[in-house]
Interface confidence: medium
Protein backbone atom coordinates (compact mmCIF):
# COMPACT_ATOMS: atom_id res chain seq x y z
CA UNK A 1 0.00 0.00 0.00
CA UNK A 2 1.29 3.64 -1.01
CA UNK A 3 -0.31 6.20 0.90
CA UNK A 4 0.38 10.14 1.39
CA UNK A 5 2.49 11.63 3.93
CA UNK A 6 2.76 14.42 6.15
CA UNK A 7 3.06 16.65 9.56
CA UNK A 8 1.83 20.29 9.55
CA UNK A 9 0.15 22.76 11.78
CA UNK A 10 -3.50 21.78 11.01
CA UNK A 11 -4.40 25.74 10.67
CA UNK A 12 -3.57 25.76 7.06
CA UNK A 13 -3.29 21.49 6.31
CA UNK A 14 -0.33 20.58 4.29
CA UNK A 15 1.35 22.56 1.98
CA UNK A 16 -0.06 21.27 -1.51
CA UNK A 17 3.40 21.05 -2.60
CA UNK A 18 5.08 19.37 0.44
CA UNK A 19 3.22 15.94 -0.10
CA UNK A 20 4.95 12.67 -0.07
CA UNK A 21 4.26 9.55 -0.67
CA UNK A 22 4.97 6.65 1.52
CA UNK A 23 5.52 2.94 0.89
CA UNK A 24 3.74 1.08 3.84
CA UNK A 25 5.37 -1.25 6.18
CA UNK A 26 4.03 -4.91 5.51
CA UNK A 27 0.61 -5.97 6.51
CA UNK A 28 -0.30 -2.22 7.09
CA UNK A 29 -3.82 -1.80 5.05
CA UNK A 30 -4.81 1.59 5.46
CA UNK A 31 -4.04 5.29 4.54
CA UNK A 32 -4.63 7.85 7.50
CA UNK A 33 -5.34 11.13 8.11
CA UNK A 34 -5.35 12.66 11.44
CA UNK A 35 -6.13 16.38 12.98
CA UNK A 36 -5.85 16.57 16.34
CA UNK A 37 -6.72 19.88 17.92
CA UNK A 38 -6.22 20.52 21.62
CA UNK A 39 -7.77 23.80 23.58
CA UNK A 40 -5.86 25.81 26.46
CA UNK A 41 -6.63 28.83 28.10
CA UNK A 42 -3.56 29.99 25.99
CA UNK A 43 -5.62 28.96 22.68
CA UNK A 44 -5.49 26.29 20.26
CA UNK A 45 -3.14 24.67 19.07
CA UNK A 46 -3.60 21.90 15.76
CA UNK A 47 -2.25 19.69 13.91
CA UNK A 48 -2.52 17.68 10.73
CA UNK A 49 -0.72 14.38 10.36
CA UNK A 50 -1.02 11.79 7.12
CA UNK A 51 1.01 8.53 6.47
CA UNK A 52 0.33 4.77 7.09
CA UNK A 53 -2.25 3.65 9.79
CA UNK A 54 -3.97 0.75 11.65
CA UNK A 55 -7.10 -0.61 12.00
CA UNK A 56 -10.26 -0.48 9.55
CA UNK A 57 -11.02 1.99 7.27
CA UNK A 58 -13.44 4.60 7.94
CA UNK A 59 -14.25 8.14 9.97
CA UNK A 60 -14.09 8.28 13.44
CA UNK A 61 -14.88 11.67 15.33
CA UNK A 62 -13.47 11.88 19.08
CA UNK A 63 -13.81 14.94 21.74
CA UNK A 64 -11.99 14.41 25.02
CA UNK A 65 -11.89 16.42 28.20
CA UNK A 66 -8.42 15.73 29.33
CA UNK A 67 -9.08 17.28 32.92
CA UNK A 68 -9.82 20.99 31.72
CA UNK A 69 -8.18 20.71 28.01
CA UNK A 70 -10.48 20.12 26.07
CA UNK A 71 -8.99 17.53 22.82
CA UNK A 72 -10.65 17.44 19.31
CA UNK A 73 -9.26 14.20 17.23
CA UNK A 74 -10.69 13.62 13.06
CA UNK A 75 -9.67 10.27 12.18
CA UNK A 76 -10.19 9.12 8.94
CA UNK A 77 -9.05 5.63 7.11
CA UNK A 78 -9.09 4.06 3.86
CA UNK A 79 -8.00 1.18 1.77
CA UNK A 80 -6.51 2.12 -1.64
CA UNK A 81 -3.42 3.38 -2.69
CA UNK A 82 -2.94 7.18 -2.42
CA UNK A 83 -6.60 7.63 -0.98
CA UNK A 84 -5.58 9.93 2.02
CA UNK A 85 -5.62 13.48 0.08
CA UNK B 1 -12.73 30.79 -14.35
CA UNK B 2 -9.74 31.20 -12.33
CA UNK B 3 -7.64 33.76 -13.06
CA UNK B 4 -4.64 35.41 -11.49
CA UNK B 5 -3.52 38.99 -13.00
CA UNK B 6 -0.28 40.58 -11.97
CA UNK B 7 0.97 43.74 -11.72
CA UNK B 8 3.85 46.56 -10.10
CA UNK B 9 6.79 45.41 -12.46
CA UNK B 10 8.55 47.75 -14.17
CA UNK B 11 12.36 49.49 -13.98
CA UNK B 12 14.12 50.18 -11.28
CA UNK B 13 18.02 51.10 -9.79
CA UNK B 14 19.83 48.41 -7.75
CA UNK B 15 19.30 48.81 -4.26
CA UNK B 16 15.77 49.92 -4.84
CA UNK B 17 12.36 48.83 -3.98
CA UNK B 18 9.28 47.42 -5.79
CA UNK B 19 5.29 46.11 -4.55
CA UNK B 20 3.95 43.40 -6.93
CA UNK B 21 0.28 42.65 -6.49
CA UNK B 22 -1.21 39.67 -7.85
CA UNK B 23 -5.53 40.05 -8.15
CA UNK B 24 -6.68 36.34 -7.53
CA UNK B 25 -10.69 35.65 -9.19
CA UNK B 26 -12.30 32.53 -9.80
CA UNK B 27 -11.40 30.62 -6.58
CA UNK B 28 -11.73 30.91 -3.17
CA UNK B 29 -8.76 32.90 -2.34
CA UNK B 30 -8.92 31.95 1.30
CA UNK B 31 -8.44 28.78 1.17
CA UNK B 32 -5.57 28.57 -1.53
CA UNK B 33 -1.81 28.46 -0.92
CA UNK B 34 -0.18 30.93 -3.35
CA UNK B 35 3.49 31.51 -4.45
CA UNK B 36 5.77 33.37 -6.39
CA UNK B 37 8.28 31.82 -9.31
CA UNK B 38 10.15 34.01 -11.51
CA UNK B 39 11.59 33.52 -14.50
CA UNK B 40 15.33 35.40 -15.70
CA UNK B 41 15.55 36.62 -19.16
CA UNK B 42 16.12 33.42 -21.00
CA UNK B 43 16.59 30.98 -18.28
CA UNK B 44 14.31 28.58 -15.93
CA UNK B 45 11.91 29.14 -13.29
CA UNK B 46 12.82 29.63 -9.86
CA UNK B 47 10.28 29.58 -6.96
CA UNK B 48 11.01 32.91 -5.05
CA UNK B 49 8.36 32.69 -1.88
CA UNK B 50 5.12 31.02 -0.65
CA UNK B 51 2.61 31.56 1.74
CA UNK B 52 -0.74 29.76 3.37
CA UNK B 53 -3.72 30.28 2.97
CA UNK B 54 -4.38 32.08 6.31
CA UNK B 55 -0.61 33.70 5.85
CA UNK B 56 0.49 32.19 8.89
CA UNK B 57 3.13 29.60 7.46
CA UNK B 58 5.76 31.82 4.91
CA UNK B 59 8.57 30.39 3.07
CA UNK B 60 11.44 31.79 1.23
CA UNK B 61 14.15 30.81 -1.17
CA UNK B 62 17.51 31.52 0.35
CA UNK B 63 18.27 34.14 -2.93
CA UNK B 64 15.94 36.38 -1.76
CA UNK B 65 15.71 36.04 1.96
CA UNK B 66 15.94 39.00 4.19
CA UNK B 67 15.05 41.15 0.87
CA UNK B 68 11.90 39.97 0.00
CA UNK B 69 8.56 40.23 1.53
CA UNK B 70 5.40 38.00 0.76
CA UNK B 71 1.92 38.53 2.41
CA UNK B 72 -1.71 38.45 1.17
CA UNK B 73 -5.13 40.45 2.10
CA UNK B 74 -8.07 37.65 1.62
CA UNK B 75 -10.75 40.55 2.38
CA UNK B 76 -9.29 42.14 -1.45
CA UNK B 77 -8.23 38.64 -2.75
CA UNK B 78 -4.68 39.93 -3.44
CA UNK B 79 -1.15 38.68 -3.10
CA UNK B 80 1.78 40.87 -3.29
CA UNK B 81 5.17 40.74 -3.14
CA UNK B 82 7.77 43.32 -1.13
CA UNK B 83 11.00 43.64 -3.14
CA UNK B 84 13.58 45.43 -1.24
CA UNK B 85 17.33 46.04 -1.76
CA UNK B 86 17.09 44.93 -5.52
CA UNK B 87 19.80 43.30 -7.42
CA UNK B 88 20.53 42.92 -11.22
CA UNK B 89 20.31 39.44 -10.70
CA UNK B 90 16.47 39.45 -9.60
CA UNK B 91 15.72 41.06 -12.85
CA UNK B 92 12.96 38.29 -14.26
CA UNK B 93 9.13 37.83 -15.37
CA UNK B 94 7.54 37.43 -11.86
CA UNK B 95 4.21 35.29 -11.74
CA UNK B 96 2.26 34.34 -8.82
CA UNK B 97 1.20 30.78 -8.90
CA UNK B 98 -2.01 28.85 -7.48
CA UNK B 99 -0.76 25.68 -5.29
CA UNK B 100 -4.26 23.41 -6.40
CA UNK B 101 -4.08 19.65 -5.81
CA UNK B 102 0.07 18.97 -5.06
CA UNK B 103 1.07 21.49 -7.31
CA UNK B 104 1.23 25.27 -9.10
CA UNK B 105 -2.31 24.46 -11.43
CA UNK B 106 -2.88 28.29 -12.23
CA UNK B 107 -0.16 30.93 -13.57
CA UNK B 108 -0.74 34.49 -13.98
CA UNK B 109 0.49 35.89 -17.26
CA UNK B 110 3.82 37.10 -15.22
CA UNK B 111 4.94 41.30 -15.03
CA UNK B 112 8.88 42.28 -15.71
CA UNK B 113 11.01 43.66 -13.19
CA UNK B 114 14.35 44.73 -14.91
CA UNK B 115 17.03 46.04 -12.18
CA UNK B 116 19.42 47.95 -14.13
CA UNK B 117 21.32 51.61 -13.38
CA UNK C 1 22.77 24.80 -11.60
CA UNK C 2 18.98 23.53 -10.75
CA UNK C 3 18.96 21.00 -7.97
CA UNK C 4 16.79 18.93 -10.52
CA UNK C 5 18.55 17.81 -13.80
CA UNK C 6 17.25 17.55 -16.75
CA UNK C 7 18.63 17.62 -20.48
CA UNK C 8 19.05 20.73 -21.64
CA UNK C 9 17.37 19.77 -25.05
CA UNK C 10 15.36 16.74 -27.07
CA UNK C 11 13.76 16.44 -30.48
CA UNK C 12 11.30 13.99 -32.20
CA UNK C 13 9.66 13.69 -35.56
CA UNK C 14 5.82 13.96 -35.44
CA UNK C 15 4.55 10.72 -34.21
CA UNK C 16 7.22 9.87 -32.30
CA UNK C 17 7.70 8.97 -29.13
CA UNK C 18 9.98 11.32 -26.34
CA UNK C 19 10.88 10.67 -23.13
CA UNK C 20 12.59 13.77 -20.97
CA UNK C 21 14.63 12.52 -17.50
CA UNK C 22 14.29 14.56 -14.37
CA UNK C 23 16.94 13.29 -11.78
CA UNK C 24 17.19 14.42 -8.38
CA UNK C 25 18.78 13.44 -5.08
CA UNK C 26 17.74 12.35 -1.65
CA UNK C 27 16.87 15.50 -0.24
CA UNK C 28 13.92 15.64 -2.63
CA UNK C 29 12.14 12.86 -5.58
CA UNK C 30 14.36 10.23 -3.47
CA UNK C 31 12.82 11.67 0.17
CA UNK C 32 9.44 10.55 -1.59
CA UNK C 33 8.12 13.82 -2.65
CA UNK C 34 6.16 13.65 -5.73
CA UNK C 35 6.98 15.13 -8.93
CA UNK C 36 5.45 17.59 -10.76
CA UNK C 37 5.95 18.42 -15.00
CA UNK C 38 4.91 22.17 -16.33
CA UNK C 39 4.79 22.88 -19.77
CA UNK C 40 5.86 26.20 -21.14
CA UNK C 41 4.58 27.13 -24.84
CA UNK C 42 7.06 30.23 -26.44
CA UNK C 43 6.52 33.42 -24.59
CA UNK C 44 3.60 32.38 -22.34
CA UNK C 45 3.41 31.35 -18.76
CA UNK C 46 4.04 28.07 -17.58
CA UNK C 47 1.01 25.42 -17.14
CA UNK C 48 0.60 22.55 -15.01
CA UNK C 49 1.34 19.40 -17.18
CA UNK C 50 1.50 16.47 -14.79
CA UNK C 51 1.04 16.47 -11.55
CA UNK C 52 1.77 13.86 -8.37
CA UNK C 53 4.24 12.11 -10.65
CA UNK C 54 1.87 10.34 -12.92
CA UNK C 55 -2.05 12.41 -12.39
CA UNK C 56 -2.83 14.65 -15.75
CA UNK C 57 -5.17 17.76 -15.02
CA UNK C 58 -8.61 17.78 -17.15
CA UNK C 59 -7.94 18.79 -20.35
CA UNK C 60 -4.27 17.19 -20.63
CA UNK C 61 -4.41 14.87 -23.34
CA UNK C 62 -3.40 11.35 -22.58
CA UNK C 63 -0.26 11.12 -24.96
CA UNK C 64 1.73 13.10 -21.93
CA UNK C 65 2.07 10.19 -19.16
CA UNK C 66 4.75 10.80 -16.16
CA UNK C 67 6.66 8.27 -13.57
CA UNK C 68 9.11 7.98 -10.73
CA UNK C 69 11.01 5.65 -10.04
CA UNK C 70 14.09 6.39 -6.99
CA UNK C 71 15.67 9.84 -7.04
CA UNK C 72 14.34 10.51 -11.32
CA UNK C 73 11.19 11.03 -12.64
CA UNK C 74 10.43 11.36 -16.44
CA UNK C 75 8.06 12.41 -18.55
CA UNK C 76 6.95 10.55 -21.90
CA UNK C 77 5.06 12.19 -25.02
CA UNK C 78 3.89 9.85 -27.54
CA UNK C 79 2.11 10.87 -30.95
CA UNK C 80 4.52 14.13 -31.03
CA UNK C 81 2.97 17.17 -32.79
CA UNK C 82 4.16 20.40 -33.70
CA UNK C 83 2.21 22.18 -30.88
CA UNK C 84 4.30 20.35 -28.43
CA UNK C 85 7.04 22.21 -29.23
CA UNK C 86 8.02 24.65 -26.08
CA UNK C 87 10.11 24.07 -22.72
CA UNK C 88 9.12 21.24 -20.18
CA UNK C 89 10.33 21.64 -16.86
CA UNK C 90 10.01 19.16 -14.01
CA UNK C 91 9.56 19.83 -10.00
CA UNK C 92 9.42 18.63 -6.56
CA UNK C 93 9.49 19.56 -2.78
CA UNK C 94 13.06 19.95 -1.42
CA UNK C 95 14.00 19.21 2.42
CA UNK C 96 17.32 21.12 2.34
CA UNK C 97 16.28 24.07 0.45
CA UNK C 98 12.71 23.97 2.56
CA UNK C 99 11.18 24.59 -0.90
CA UNK C 100 10.07 23.30 -4.06
CA UNK C 101 12.81 23.00 -6.60
CA UNK C 102 12.29 22.93 -10.64
CA UNK C 103 14.57 21.22 -12.66
CA UNK C 104 17.01 23.52 -15.43
CA UNK C 105 14.10 22.53 -18.37
CA UNK C 106 14.12 20.70 -21.66
CA UNK C 107 13.52 22.52 -25.01
CA UNK C 108 11.48 20.02 -26.88
CA UNK C 109 12.15 20.65 -30.88
CA UNK C 110 9.30 19.10 -33.20
CA UNK C 111 11.53 18.46 -36.14
CA UNK C 112 10.67 18.45 -39.54
Known amino acids: LECYSCVQKADDGCSPNKMKTVKCAPGVDVCTEAVGAVETIHGQFSLAVRGCGSGLPGKNDRGLDLHGLLAFIQLQQCAQDRCNA | EVQLLESGGGLVQPGGSLRLSCAASGFTFSNAWMSWVRQAPGKGLEWVSY????????YYADSVKGRFTISRDNSKNTLYLQMNSLRAEDTAVYYC??????????WGQGTLVTVTS | QSVLTQPPSASGTPGQRVTISCTGSSSNIGAGYVVHWYQQLPGTAPKLLIY???KRPSGVPDRFSGSKSGTSASLAISGLRSEDEADYYC???????????FGGGTKLTVLG
Open chain 3, 91 to 101: AAWDDRLNGPV
Open chain 2, 97 to 106: AREGLWAFDY
Open chain 2, 51 to 58: ISSSGSTI
Open chain 3, 52 to 54: DNN
